[in-house]
C-alpha cells in the first residue's frame, strides 16, 4: 500500500494510507516446518550462503553508509528505471530516490518516487523505508489490526468466554482464538463480556520452546549441514543446480532477462517460506525479507549479487498458455478483497482515465457526479466512484472486470500496475486455469 | 481545484532581467514537473524548458539556454523563470503549464497552464 | 528537433458540419506503445486548452465531438458536429522528444 505524496494527484483530501500489513511483512507466524524434499534443503544452503551479499544492496544503505550524498544517475534500459530510482521528464535518467524520504519497488517509469509512509501512533516501525520499500508498519503488542477494517490497530481480547478455549494468541494482525471445549469449532464475532477466562501475556506463545524443541532444531540444524556437505561434493550437484536454477527463474525463464511487467518485490513464495523456516532468524536480516503469501508456486525472487536490482522472469510460455486468475489470497470475500484495494487505484490509474473507466463499469454520468461531488477531496474521486460501482453491482464486482475495462481503454500499463499491485500487497494470489472457469 | 496563478504583465528595458513567478495551488506542487512556453504576438509556442519541483532539476530548449533560468520555491509552491539580457525579441507572452503525468509512458501533457505573463521589452 | 507541421493555417467550416485538422511530424513521436502527440485550443487572450493527449484521449470536461486519431508521424483532430465555440486556433504538440515541440496552428472560422 503505496503511500503517495510527491507524485499524489492532489494534496488535499488525501486517504490515510497504513504500511503494508503482517501478510506482507512477515508471512505466517514464526514456528518450524519440515522441509518437503531434498531440494528445499540444497536451496536452504544456498540462500543462506548468499543471503547476506544478495539481499542488501546500496540502495538500501542509511545515508551515510552510502558513496554520494547527491542523487545517482544511470540510464533507463527500455524506458524503465530499476527499483530505487525514478526517471527523469527526458527519459535519460534514473534518479535515486532520497533515502528515508521515497522509494520506488518496482522497475518504474514513475516521474518520482513514492513517498514513504510515517507509522501512526500505535503502531511499531518494523522497518524503515529505503529507496526500494515502504516503511513496514504493525501493531504495537496487545492490539492487532484486521483485514477487513485496516484503518486502525484494536485491542486484543484479554481471554475467552465461558465454555471456549484459547488456540491461538494475539499477533499484531489477529485476535486471540477460542474455540468451543467440545465441538472445537472456532468462534467468530465479539464478545460482550468476558467472563471465565484464560489468560496470557499478549504476544507470548501459547507454550514455550521445550528441550524437545531445542533438540529437534539441532538435528535439523545438523542433516541440513550434512546433507549440503554431500550434496556438494557429489555429482547430485549437476543434477540439482539446474533444478535451482528453474525455480529462482520462475521455473525455467532465463535468469538474464527481467521482467518489466509482473515484478512483485517482496512477494517470496511458498518455496521461499521453506526455505526461511529452516534458517535461524538471525541468519537473513528480518527486514529484507519481507516474506508473503504465495502470488505463484513457483519464482524465488532472491536478488544475486550481480542482479541486485533486477528480479527474475516468470516463464513467458506457461503465461501464455492459461489466463491467470486472480483470487483472494486468505481465500476471503472476492469483492470485498478486491474494495480494500481500491485506495490505492488512484495511483496507478492515470486522473484522465478514472472517469472514462468508470463509465466502462456501467457508472452513468449523474453517479460519477454524485461521487464527485461526495468525495473527501480530488485524491478520493476515484475511490468513492469505484465503492459507488461495487455498491451497484454487488457480486458481479470482480477484479477481471475492473482490468479487462482497463484493458479495453488501453490502460495496459495501469491494468499491469494494479495486477502487481494487488499481488504484491499480499491480497490477491495468481490462481492458474482457463478463462472460462474465471474468478471474482 | 488546480490553479496557477501568474505575476501581472511587465514593461521592462533592454539590457534588463525580470523574474516571472508562477504560484501553484490545488495539488502537490513537487509531484508535477512544471514548463514554462513563449508566444510572440499572433505566433506559434514555443517551449522554453521545465523545472523539477522536488528537486530544482532544470532542462532547456537549447534556443533558450542562456536566456532563461528556472527555479522553484517549494515552501510557497511557486515557479519562477527569469530572463536575462532582454531584447525586444523577448516582448511576448508566458505561460507556466503544468505537466499532469505521473507516469512517463502517461505522455507528458500540459493539463493546467498559467493565466499568461505579458512582457514588453522597450526603451 | 521533430518539427510538426499543420499543413492548413486556416479552416472554414459550416456549422454542424466535421471539421478535420491535420498534424504531421517530421519523426515518429511514439513511445511506450504510446503517441506522445496532444491537442490544445486557444482562443484569444486565453493561455492554451488541452483537448485531447496522447493522440487520442479526451481530456476531462472536454466534449465528446472532439476526437483525435492517429500514430507515430500523422495525427488529426476532428470536431464533429462543429459548433460556435469552437472558433479558434488549434495546436498539436509533442512530448516524446526534447525540446518539445508545437505545431504552427490551425485557426478554425465558421463559414
Known amino acids: 500500500m503505496e503511500q503517495r505524496g510527491q507524485n499524489a494527484p492532489a494534496a488535499s483530501g488525501a486517504r490515510k494510507r497504513h504500511g503494508p500489513g503482517p501478510r506482507e511483512a512477515r508471512g505466517a507466524r514464526p514456528g518450524p516446518r519440515v522441509p518437503k524434499t531434498l531440494v528445499l534443503v540444497v536451496a536452504a544452503v544456498l540462500l543462506l550462503v548468499s543471503a547476506e551479499s544478495a539481499l542488501i544492496t546500496q540502495q538500501d544503505l542509511a545515508p551515510q553508509q552510502r558513496a554520494a550524498p547527491q542523487q545517482k544517475r544511470s540510464s533507463p534500459s527500455e524506458g524503465l528505471c530499476p527499483p530505487g530510482h525514478h526517471i527523469s521528464e527526458d527519459g535519460r535518467d534514473c534518479i535515486s530516490c532520497k533515502y528515508g524520504q521515497d522509494y520506488s519497488t518496482h522497475w518504474n517509469d514513475l516521474l518520482f518516487c513514492l513517498r514513504c509512509t510515517r507509522c501512526d501512533s500505535g503502531e511499531v516501525e518494523l522497518s524503515p523505508c529505503t529507496t526500494t520499500r515502504n516503511t513496514v508498519c504493525q501493531c504495537e503488542e496487545g492490539t492487532f489490526r484486521e483485514e477487513d477494517s485496516p484503518e486502525m490497530c484494536r485491542k486484543c481480547r484479554t481471554g475467552c468466554p465461558r465454555g471456549m478455549v484459547k488456540v491461538g494468541d494475539c499477533t499484531p494482525w489477529s485476535d486471540i482464538e477460542c474455540v468451543h471445549k467440545e465441538s472445537g469449532t472456532k468462534h467468530s464475532g465479539e464478545v460482550p463480556a468476558v467472563e471465565e477466562t484464560v489468560t496470557s501475556s499478549p504476544g507470548t506463545p501459547a507454550s514455550p520452546c521445550s528441550l524437545s524443541g531445542i533438540i529437534i532444531g539441532v538435528t535439523v540444524a545438523a542433516v541440513v549441514l550434512i546433507v549440503a556437505v554431500f550434496v556438494c561434493k557429489s555429482l547430485l550437484w549437476k543434477k540439482v543446480l539446474p533444478y535451482l536454477k528453474g525455480i529462482c527463474s520462475g521455473g525455467g525463464g532465463d535468469p538474464e532477462r527481467v521482467d518489466r511487467s509482473s515484478q512483485r518485490p517482496g512477494a517470496e513464495d511458498n518455496v521461499l517460506n521453506e526455505i526461511v523456516s529452516i534458517l535461524q532468524p538471525t541468519q537473513v536480516p528480518e527486514q529484507e525479507m519481507e516474506v508473503q503469501e504465495p502470488a505463484e508456486p513457483t519464482g524465488v525472487n532472491m536478488l544475486s549479487p550481480g542482479e541486485s536490482e533486477h528480479l527474475l522472469e516468470p516463464a513467458e510460455a506457461e503465461r501464455s498458455q492459461r489466463r491467470r486468475l486472480l483470487v483472494p489470497a486468505n481465500e476471503g470475500d472476492p469483492t470485498e478483497t478486491l474494495r480494500q484495494c481500491f485506495d490505492d487505484f488512484a495511483d496507478l490509474v492515470p486522473f484522465d482515465s478514472w472517469e472514462p473507466l468508470m463509465r466502462k463499469l456501467g457508472l452513468m454520468d449523474n453517479e460519477i457526479k454524485v461521487a464527485k461531488a461526495e468525495a473527501a477531496g480530488h485524491r478520493d474521486t476515484l475511490y468513492t466512484m469505484l465503492i459507488k460501482w461495487v455498491n451497484k453491482t454487488g457480486r458481479d464486482a470482480s477484479v477481471h472486470t475492473l482490468l479487462d475495462a482497463l484493458e479495453t481503454l488501453g490502460e495496459r500499463l495501469a491494468k499491469q500496475k494494479i495486477e502487481d499491485h494487488l499481488l504484491s500487497s499480499g491480497k490477491f494470489m495468481y490462481l492458474e486455469g482457463n478463462a472460462d472457469s474465471a474468478m471474482s | 481545484e488546480v490553479q496557477l496563478q501568474q505575476s501581472g504583465p511587465d514593461l521592462v528595458k533592454p539590457g534588463a532581467s525580470v523574474k516571472i513567478s508562477c504560484k501553484a495551488s490545488g495539488y502537490s506542487f513537487t509531484g508535477h514537473y512544471m514548463h514554462w512556453v513563449k508566444q510572440s504576438h499572433g505566433q506559434s509556442l514555443e517551449w522554453i524548458g521545465r523545472v523539477n519541483p522536488n528537486n530544482g532539476g532544470t532542462g532547456y530548449n537549447q534556443k533558450f539556454k542562456d536566456k532563461a533560468i528556472l527555479t522553484v520555491d517549494k515552501p510557497s509552491s511557486t515557479a519562477y523563470m527569469e530572463l536575462r539580457s532582454l531584447t525586444s525579441e523577448d516582448s511576448a507572452v508566458y505561460y507556466c503549464?503544468?505537466?499532469?503525468?505521473?507516469?512517463?509512458?502517461?505522455?507528458?501533457?500540459?493539463?493546467?497552464w498559467g493565466q499568461g505573463t505579458t512582457l514588453t521589452v522597450s526603451s | 528537433d521533430i518539427v510538426l507541421t499543420q499543413s492548413t493555417p486556416s479552416l472554414a467550416v459550416s456549422l454542424g458540419q466535421r471539421a478535420t485538422i491535420s498534424c504531421r511530424a517530421s519523426?515518429?513521436?511514439?513511445?511506450?506503445?504510446?503517441?506522445?502527440m496532444h491537442w490544445f485550443q486557444q482562443k484569444p487572450g486565453q493561455p492554451p486548452k488541452l483537448l485531447i493527449y496522447?493522440?487520442?484521449n479526451l481530456e476531462s470536461g472536454i466534449p465528446a465531438r472532439f476526437s483525435g486519431s492517429g500514430s507515430r508521424t500523422d495525427f488529426t483532430l476532428t470536431i464533429n458536429p462543429v459548433e460556435a465555440d469552437d472558433v479558434a486556433t488549434y495546436y498539436c504538440?509533442?512530448?516524446?522528444?526534447?525540446?518539445?515541440?508545437f505545431g504552427g496552428g490551425t485557426k478554425l472560422e465558421i463559414k
Open positions: 503549464a503544468r505537466n499532469g503525468a505521473y507516469y512517463r509512458s502517461d505522455g507528458n501533457y500540459f493539463d493546467y
Open positions: 519523426e515518429s513521436v511514439d513511445s511506450y506503445g504510446n503517441s506522445f
Open positions: 504538440q509533442q512530448s516524446n522528444e526534447d525540446p518539445y515541440t
Open positions: 496522447r493522440a487520442s
